[in-house]
């Protein structure tokens, strides 16, 4: 006997359509775009019913239910607004992601639509979340000062400044919300003993009890750095276990643009901050900074051949800063900190140098401070940041 004529569910159709359906005849149900087959609570990839000999179909007809993309993922350092309507997450619904203003920016426009495949999709067809990238290089510091000849910093002047506490005091510069740039010699030996590295930020007072704590997940020392054999390639990166929240007191320093070389010529002034030795020979209690001009590379190299630093020479991977007469310099305890410059076009500060080495008498005449030249290491920095995939000792590149 024939089976009853099947009725297509709303937003669906039946195929094939026949005058009658007898034993072993079958039909399938197809939903229109944006709808899915649903049997009770269960989504089906396809549906076919077969007419049985007792004149009944072997399974009930499902419904065609509108696709539901579900609640959108939370956006770190941002939020999502429902554009179509409150909590509407069904086919063709629109949501808008946006980043926390002032301290984060979004690369895309942040608009996503619930598509027929059940995924929230951007106008570019991306199904992954947009990224809220930290703003870099904003500072309340205008410019002018061991640190020798320095002056105290104010809140928001050097929000990228990081205090590294281990066996010795050193510094670093936040270059992302989970990466710190520093000198290789400041963290050498810390790849195995990472737990002994105490990372603090958002502070002016070195001994402040209120700070943002970070811990290292991995330490990357430049493969060209050899400890105790000069300071060539004196650069390292610390991957933080957790991202830090960006605010006016904690913010990355920008990496130099390709045009940065024109902003770091001889006599151009940079600024360096730190808690290192001051004129009095003690570590500074408050973060100090000094504005110092870049010194001609050859002049600096010659000065250090006259009065050589044990085992070190000025290489192409270094830049020098200081006054001929002395008086303004970084010193022990400032190692790893950033020598920064203002990019007049973007009005953002960028890191040009990393405090590396200098004469034993900080701030001595013709004994310039020597800094790792960051522009030479942009590919190295980007390569490590882009390729780092998680924890594990195989990520700890060191000599």
């Amino acid at each position: 006997q024939p089976c009853p004529d099947p009725t297509a569910p709303p937003n669906g159709h039946i195929s094939p359509v026949q005058a009658t359906y007898v034993l072993k005849d079958s039909f399938s149900v197809f939903c229109k775009t944006g709808f899915e087959l649903l049997q009770g609570s269960v989504p089906l990839k396809s549906f076919t019913a077969v007419c049985q000999k007792d004149g009944s179909w072997d399974r009930p007809i499902p419904e065609c239910s509108i696709i539901d993309c579900g609640p959108p993922d939370d956006l770190p350092n941002g939020h999502v607004d429902y554009i179509t309507g409150p909590e509407v997450t069904t086919y063709k619904a629109v949501i808008q992601y946006s980043c926390e203003e002032t301290f984060y920016t979004m690369s895309s426009n942040g608009k996503y639509v619930c598509e027929a495949d059940g995924f929230w999709t951007s106008s570019k067809g991306e199904k992954s979340l947009p990224v809220c990238k930290p703003v870099c290089g904003l500072s309340t510091h205008t410019s002018g000062g061991q640190i020798i000849g320095g002056q105290p910093a104010k809140p928001g002047d050097f929000p990228w400044q990081v205090l590294l506490l281990g066996e010795t005091t050193a510094a670093g510069a936040l270059i992302h919300d989970d990466w710190v740039l520093t000198a290789a010699h400041a963290v050498y030996g810390k790849t195995e003993a990472m737990s002994s590295l105490d990372i603090r930020m958002g502070i002016l007072k070195r001994l402040s009890l209120i700070y943002t704590q970070a811990w290292p997940e991995a330490v990357f020392i430049h493969e060209g750095y050899t400890h105790g054999a000069g300071f060539d390639n004196d650069i390292a990166l610390i991957k933080l276990k957790n991202k830090v929240t960006i605010n006016r007191n904690i913010m990355p320093i920008c990496l130099p643009r390709k045009e940065a070389a024109s902003l770091m010529k001889t006599d151009f002034v940079g600024t360096v901050a730190g808690w290192g030795l001051t004129q009095k020979g003690f570590l500074a209690r408050n973060l100090m900074f000094v504005d110092i001009p870049i010194v001609d590379h050859q002049k600096c190299a010659t000065a250090y051949t006259k009065q050589p630093y044990p085992g070190a020479k000025v290489t192409v991977n270094m830049l020098c800063a200081g006054l001929d007469r002395g008086g303004k310099d970084a010193c022990r305890g400032d190692s790893g900190g950033a020598l920064v410059f203002l990019d007049n076009e973007t009005q953002r500060w960028f890191v040009g140098g990393i405090v590396s080495w200098g004469s034993i008498n900080c701030g001595g005449s013709e004994q310039y401070g020597v800094y790792t030249k960051v522009t030479n290491y942009i590919p190295w920095i980007e390569n490590i940041i882009n390729n780092f995939g998680g924890g594990g000792s195989h990520h700890h590149h060191h000599h």
Epitope: L38, Q39, G40, S41, V42, P43, L44, K45, S46, R59, S65, D68, G70, G118
Partner: antibody, heavy 118, light 107 residues
Framework: QVQLQESGPGLVKPSETLSLTCTVS??????????WGWIRQPPGKGLEWIGS???????YYNPSLKSRVTISVDTSKNQFSLKLSSVTAADTAVYYC??????????WGQGTMVTVSS | SYELMQPPSMSVSPGQTASITCSGD??????AYWYQQKPGQSPVLVIY???KRPSGIPERFSGSNSGNTATLTISGTQAMDEADYYC?????????FGGGTKLTVLG
């Protein structure tokens, strides 16, 4: 944020009926978007689906348990319940309730251990 | 009755990719779901409808399903991913779970 909480006796005698209730908070059990399900897990073993119910009372059960299972819903109390009759030691398990949204169980309750023993 | 088969255990080094399989007759014709269960905790949905991630599940979790096999892939596996993983599917409106795979993250 919807939350589910199972409640009921932790010890049931063989041949008796196991009765558990799941209380839903932070959302309405009468939502047309969801079914509500029961799943169990014997100690050290895997998960087993027991059955699911819609707020209207429509149910579907695991065929291997169908003869012994009854799932009901009380929309006024925002609760749904499980009854499993003629229990044996093999029914000793952690019993979970969960929201069934288009075939996926999310979220789950914390689970309640039920031991069948005389 | 419909059955889903999973390997009882597997191990992976941190940072490596773990692929957990689930096999069943014509499993690719229906949707597969994956749950993570840590000791003493309730299961948590990590993948639904073959390849969709619920809100809050890290992007390193992904899924696929074709032929007779569904696969849960965890790329860049972390220590916190050590858990039991269960596949699940619906066959004729009956919920079926696999036996579970214990994933151990070495080191």
């Amino acid at each position: 944020q919807v939350q589910l909480q199972e409640s009921g006796p932790g010890l049931v005698k063989p041949s008796e009926t196991l009765s558990l209730t799941c209380t839903v908070s932070g959302g309405s059990i009468s939502s047309s978007s969801y079914y509500w399900g029961w799943i169990r897990q014997p100690p050290g073993k895997g998960l087993e689906w027991i059955g699911s119910i819609y707020y209207s009372g429509s149910t579907y059960y695991n065929p291997s348990l169908k003869s012994r299972v009854t799932i009901s819903v009380d929309t006024s109390k925002n609760q749904f319940s499980l009854k499993l009759s003629s229990v044996t030691a093999a029914d000793t398990a952690v019993y979970y309730c969960a929201r069934d949204r288009r075939g996926r169980f999310d979220p789950w309750g914390q689970g309640t251990m039920v031991t069948v023993s005389s | 009755s419909y059955e889903l088969m999973q390997p009882p255990s597997m191990s992976v080094s941190p940072g490596q990719t773990a692929s957990i399989t689930c096999s069943g007759d014509k499993l690719g014709d229906i949707y597969a779901y994956w749950y993570q269960q840590k000791p003493g905790q309730s299961p948590v949905l990590v993948i639904y409808q073959d390849n969709k991630r619920p809100s809050g599940i890290p992007e390193r979790f992904s899924g696929s399903n074709s032929g007779n096999t569904a696969t849960l892939t965890i790329s860049g596996t972390q220590a916190m991913d050590e858990a039991d993983y269960y596949c699940q599917a619906w066959e004729s409106s009956t919920g079926v779970f696999g036996g579970g795979t214990k994933l151990t993250v070495l080191g």
